[in-house]
Amino acid sequence: ITQQDLAPQQRAAPQQKRSSPSEGLCPPGHHISEDGRDCISCKYGQDYSTHWNDLLFCLRCTRCDSGEVELSPCTTTRNTVCQCEEGTFREEDSPEMCRKCRTGCPRGMVKVGDCTPWSDIECVHKESGTKHSGEVPAVEETVTSSPGTPASPCS
């Protein structure tokens, strides 16, 4: 059918602290060795893992961008938590950057919601009370396949 690509990050440098996996898995704050025999601790402030796993390397800690504040630092079991600075927000559908909140509502509209790190100010029409985001709705595209006979593996 479809060949699916996965692109893991580069492996972090080997760690010293080791313990044995349980049921083939390593606890949060660790990753597994390639032979599956050892659990290796993540490096504090550099990488992390949040669940029991068999990752070959810990996940790289996020660095907060300029325009963001660090709410909590990266530990071996939790990624950095970043938040947009006051007056800016990040929407779930555009998480790559903090955008400036609007300073006011368009004519004929009233403000019913303040700027938060997660949302722009909210405006509604004075008469109807209908929300207005100022955004054009996005169209979601899905790729479908309609196979006939059983598919052979992709090369």
């Epitope: 893991p8 083939g24 898995l25 029991w52 796993n53």
Partner: nanobody
Framework: VQAGDSLRLSCAAS????????VGWFRQTPGKEREFVAA????????YYADSVKGRFTISRDNAKNTVYMQMASLKPEDTAVYYC???????????????????WGQGTQVTVSS
């Protein structure tokens, strides 16, 4: 495909490695959470299946090709979903057989089974 037909999905790592020892498949239908389907340990070949697909689906691997396959037989209309290959499976407890999520995801492929 029609109910009762077979299909094979394949999943290849784009880099040198999948980034984890176990690789699996999840599926998702509109408005529902992704659900675990099957997983395989690429080192020793141990397999894990959701009850709903046991005996019908077979997960296998070709380490030389860095590829994992899922052979789906006796397909039912309720198998209709978007199927995702996943690596870096995440578990709440070491004894769990069913992962709660994954770190790396394929782009997904639609499987539609009509009656």
């Amino acid at each position: 495909v029609q109910a009762g037909d077979s299909l094979r999905l394949s999943c290849a790592a784009s880099g040198r490695t999948f980034g984890s020892i176990r690789v699996g498949w999840f599926r998702q239908t509109p408005g529902k959470e992704r659900e675990f389907v099957a997983a395989i340990n690429r080192n020793d070949g141990t397999t894990y299946y959701a009850d709903s697909v046991k005996g019908r689906f077979t997960i296998s691997r070709d380490n030389a090709k860095n590829t994992v396959y899922m052979q789906m037989a006796s397909l039912k209309p309720e198998d209709t979903a978007v199927y995702y290959c996943a690596a870096g499976l995440q578990y709440n407890r070491s004894a769990d057989r069913v992962p709660v999520g994954a770190v790396y995801w394929g782009q997904g492929t639609q499987v539609t089974v009509s009656s």
